[in-house]
């Protein structure tokens, strides 16, 4: 999906209003310095591409993020403010339902959500030059 036509300001407002708090809740008990940010993004469409990938694509050691509250809200925000996003996700959602596993918070998941927090922060500051 090409995120170029999303309403970035609305997605930012949704993040600041509620998604950010759910990410913090997920990470509660973890020190903010515990993980290094290794995933970056260069502009808002790129950030949303990386956020989608990290939130919804299962990775080795962390297959369970898609049913977390922050993930459901992220999916809803993209569906509302990215024209045509919902239609592209129908097949992906059906595949995800088939392989759904019970929710387990592993260290790998915590690391992944820490990366997500970094991507969201970058999304909210699009005019900053990349280091």
């Amino acid at each position: 999906y090409d995120f170029t036509n999303c309403d970035f300001e609305k997605i930012k407002a949704a993040y600041l209003s509620t998604i950010s708090k759910d990410l913090i809740t997920y990470m509660s008990g973890t020190k903010s310095t515990e993980f290094n940010n290794t995933v970056s993004c260069s502009n808002r469409p790129h950030c949303l591409t990386e956020i989608q990938s990290l939130t919804f694509n299962p990775t080795a050691g962390c297959a369970s993020l898609a049913k977390e509250m922050f993930a459901m809200k992220t999916k809803a925000a993209l569906a509302i403010w990215c024209p045509g996003y919902s239609e592209t996700q129908i097949n992906a959602t059906q595949a995800m339902k088939k392989r759904r596993k019970r929710k387990v918070t592993t260290n790998k998941c915590l690391e992944q959500v820490s990366q997500l927090q970094g991507l969201w922060r970058r999304f909210n500051r699009p005019l900053l030059k990349q280091q």
């Epitope: 209003s17 509620t18 809803a76 925000a77 509302i80 403010w81």
Partner: nanobody, 132 residues
Amino acid sequence: QVQLVESGGGLVQAGGSLRLSCAASGFTFGDYAITWFRQAPGKEREGVAYISNFDGMTYYADSVKGRFTISSDNAKNTVYLQMDSLKPEDTAVYYCAAEGRMGTHSRDSVYFWAFSALYDYWGQGTQVTVSS
């Protein structure tokens, strides 16, 4: 240009009823979500009730569930808030607000409808005072 005009506020005794109206113009009413917010002195603006003019889906704040009813008349481009069993704590300025994408995505909007930062257009507000 876009306009939202609220009316129907006033002074009422606890246990009484009021019906607020929000008349809209300047946008495609049938695609929009309209939400009633309220703001009491010294408090944050609070989402009270949401309706999608696209499919009629409604959401309510827990504090008003069973007492307030939101409805829409697409022919008149007007949304109503019927407020029954009013309490002193319902005293506030009531605003209606409109958003263009949450109307056509009402199921996904369950997470976001009550957040004022997401709305594009606002009315000037109408005062509701409930005396004990």
